[in-house]
């Protein structure tokens, strides 16, 4: 059993048939030594009396908040919440597997730039009765400072029968070096509590292989003269990383009608202009990349082509 | 060229193949379809690798004020990089497939290091640590872990010298 | 499959002008780019020009401008490649090639040689 | 136009050997770079589009590498079917240019 903030208990449980669970010693406090009787939720009924409490924890029927009481007036609160662990391995039920970019991904983060700012989100299909807190640093073993603040529900969406909704916290690191080499990872753990169910989530990463730029800005189409040919130019995002002669980007330009499967120019580029054939019903999209180090491409910026 | 103490690098060469050593560094050991390194207790194998750390002056202000300090510091990951892809590490088995893009990886490390540093002049170099794997799987294992090490090392090398040839360069 | 087939060898005087086709099958004919990419006797490759048989878009080669037409018949699924003015300059195999993206050449017909001889 | 050279113009190789052909553009041209293979008679065949990705259906000894002005095509342990003329093309701007290409012969 451990503490998991002022008067809230993580009990850690084998969870297998007949298991013989945990025993629990609850301690009331208070200075008063006699007339302590105990009750757990909302129950009148008493489960034992003393300044202490022995209890055998098996299942969630045992978890729950119990309360020490004299003649009446409630002296202190200790809330038991569960952690199961199922042949060697914690529970992930809260939190729904997002699979990208690999199984057993509960957590996805990511940075606009190299600020030392991200962003992680994660699902769930649980609509009430759900609590996250977010804890971050840089390295472990002699941790730098991560502030994260309150995680937020930031989508909802419908999945088939489902309601699907998704969470998300941002961070800064405090003292964020924006042109050094990561050595260490940054290490993200969130707590979810679902009603008495406690579980933990953690990513490790390091921010340059969770960069994803913005798509770029201010896309213009300009004809030339006696060709089929227009030069499309844009701008860096105005969230990424400067100067941008130190922190470059890379770029894909695309001709493409509605339809994936329809025929299309692509080129590459290190500018922000290129020439490109457009076509009627068509659309000209750019997305960006940062130049040196292969993290994810940006979301495309469009324009039609007409 | 950059001489100890002394004068500007060639920084338009240096972004070139900086920038190829980027190329060649993703072509090596591409991101896709390997394991997560990290969960494969990352410290003890690449935590001797040097690093662009935050004192180093490769930060655009620090490049103004004194480029030599960061020069110094790519010249010395070059170097160690260069030594430990010839190292048994990269030439013991599993044996590299012979179009893996380590041999010219090897090549172009050595070639920007020699660009920063001419014969006759010597910055101090790192030791390099003795990593020497026992078994095959060990050393595939430590492979990836360098060559991730390498990309981000590379990556920060060529913004310094992208950065360099565009404010830089006389 | 994806197939182009062309017509057969041509045999041309100097000033003269000459058509030769390219027929599509196994796709549908306006879903590629169709291009014309040259190749004189133990010489290199020289792309010609481009047509879009969806809408007759045309893009040529600056060197061939004002001699070279290329046309595309999408009842008959064919592309065809027009050059005149011909000089022994232009005895080459041309080829046609296909893709769905425009920059490169995904599938090529079997070539067809033109020699250009007084 | 962008100029695209190719070296060596030709390399005498043996079954199994590492062949690496390379080709510099004239200017950047970013990785708008794609390979071709051409046999005596035959229409050219495209190996590697966009310098490095790799088509289906063709052996995995062939790759490539490189972008802005550099780039190479490696052949890794040569195969008899292998000996053909190899071309480079630029795909940066129109109009569209191949390099002189490079003829892998029998030693």
């Known amino acids: 059993i451990w503490e998991l903030k002022k008067d809230v208990y993580v009990v850690e449980l084998d969870w297998y048939p007949d298991a013989p669970g945990e025993m629990v010693v609850l301690t009331c406090d208070t200075p008063e030594e006699d007339g302590i009787t105990w009750t757990l939720d909302q129950s009148s009924e008493v489960l034992g009396s003393g300044k202490t409490l022995t209890i055998q924890v098996k299942e969630f029927g045992d978890a729950g908040q119990y309360t020490c009481h004299k003649g009446g007036e409630v002296l202190s609160h200790s809330l038991l919440l569960l952690h199961k662990k199922e042949d060697g391995i914690w529970s992930t039920d809260i939190l729904k597997d997002q699979k990208e970019p690999k199984n057993k991904t509960f957590l996805r983060c990511e940075a606009k730039n190299y600020s030392g700012r991200f962003t992680c989100w994660w699902l769930t299909t649980i609509s009430t009765d759900l609590t996250f807190s977010v804890k971050s640093s840089r390295g472990s073993s002699d941790p730098q400072g991560v502030t994260c603040g309150a995680a937020t529900l930031s989508a909802e969406r419908v999945r088939g029968d489902n309601k699907e909704y998704e969470y998300s916290v941002e961070c800064q690191e405090d003292s964020a070096c924006p042109a050094a080499e990561e050595s260490l990872p940054i290490e993200v753990m969130v707590d979810a509590v679902h009603k008495l169910k406690y579980e933990n989530y953690t990513s490790s990463f390091f921010i340059r292989d969770i960069i994803k730029p913005d798509p770029p800005k201010n896309l213009q189409l300009k004809p030339l003269k006696n060709s089929r040919q227009v030069e499309v130019s844009w701008e860096y995002p105005d969230t990424w990383s400067t100067p941008h002669s130190y922190f470059s980007l890379t770029f894909c330009v695309q001709v493409q009608g509605k339809s994936k499967r329809e025929k299309k120019d692509r080129v590459f580029t290190d500018k922000t202009s290129a020439t490109v054939i457009c076509r009627k019903n068509a659309s000209i999209s750019v997305r960006a990349q940062d130049r040196y180090y292969s993290s994810s491409w940006s979301e495309w910026a469009s324009v039609p082509c007409s | 060229r950059a001489v100890p103490g002394g004068s500007s690098p060639a920084w338009t060469q240096c972004q070139q193949l900086s920038q190829k050593l980027c190329t060649l560094a993703w072509s090596a050991h591409p991101l896709v379809g390997h394991m997560d390194l990290r969960e494969e207790g990352d410290e003890e194998t690449t935590n001797d690798v040097p690093h662009i750390q935050c004192g180093d002056g490769c930060d655009p202000q620090g490049l103004r004020d004194n480029s030599q300090f960061c020069l110094q510091r790519i010249h010395q990951g070059l170097i160690f990089y260069e030594k430990l892809l010839g190292s048994d590490i990269f030439t013991g088995e599993p044996s590299l497939l012979p179009d893996s893009p380590v041999g010219q990886l090897h090549a172009s490390l050595l070639g920007l290091s020699q660009l920063l540093q001419p014969e006759g002049h010597h910055w101090e170099t790192q030791q390099i640590p003795s990593l020497s794997p026992s078994q095959p799987w060990q050393r595939l294992l430590l492979r990836f872990k360098i060559l991730r090490s390498l990309q981000a090392f590379v990556a920060v090398a060529a913004r310094v010298f992208a950065h360099g040839a565009a404010t830089l360069s006389p | 499959e994806v197939q182009l087939v062309q017509s057969g060898a041509e045999v041309k005087k100097p000033g003269a002008t000459v058509k030769i086709s390219c027929k599509a099958s196994g796709y549908t004919f306006s879903d590629y780019y169709l291009h014309w990419v040259r190749q004189a006797p133990e010489k290199g490759l020289e792309w010609m020009g481009w047509?879009?048989?969806?809408?007759?878009?045309?893009e040529y080669a600056p060197k061939f401008q004002g001699r070279v037409t290329i046309t595309a018949d999408t009842s008959t699924d064919t592309g065809y490649l027009e050059l005149s003015s011909l000089r022994s300059e232009d005895t080459a195999v041309y080829y046609c090639?296909?893709?769905?993206?425009?920059?490169?050449?995904?599938?090529w017909g079997q070539g067809t040689l033109v020699t250009v001889s007084s | 136009d962008i100029q695209m050279t190719q070296s060596p113009s030709s390399v005498s190789a043996s079954v199994g050997d590492r062949v690496t052909i390379t080709c510099r553009a004239s200017?950047?041209?970013?990785?708008?770079l794609h390979w071709y293979q051409q046999k005596p008679g035959k229409a050219p065949k495209l190996l590697i589009y966009f310098a490095s990705q790799s088509i289906s259906g063709v052996p995995s000894r062939f790759s490539g590498s490189g972008s802005g002005t550099d780039f190479s095509l490696t052949i890794n342990s040569l195969q008899p079917e292998d000996f053909a003329r190899y071309y480079c093309?630029?795909?940066?701007?129109?109009?569209?240019?191949f390099g002189g290409g490079t003829k892998v012969e029998i030693k």
């Open positions: 093309q630029q795909s940066n701007s129109f109009p569209l240019t």
């Open positions: 200017q950047s041209i970013s990785i708008n």
């Open positions: 090639a296909a893709n769905k993206e425009l920059r490169y050449f995904d599938v």
């Open positions: 047509i879009d048989p969806e809408n007759g878009d045309t």
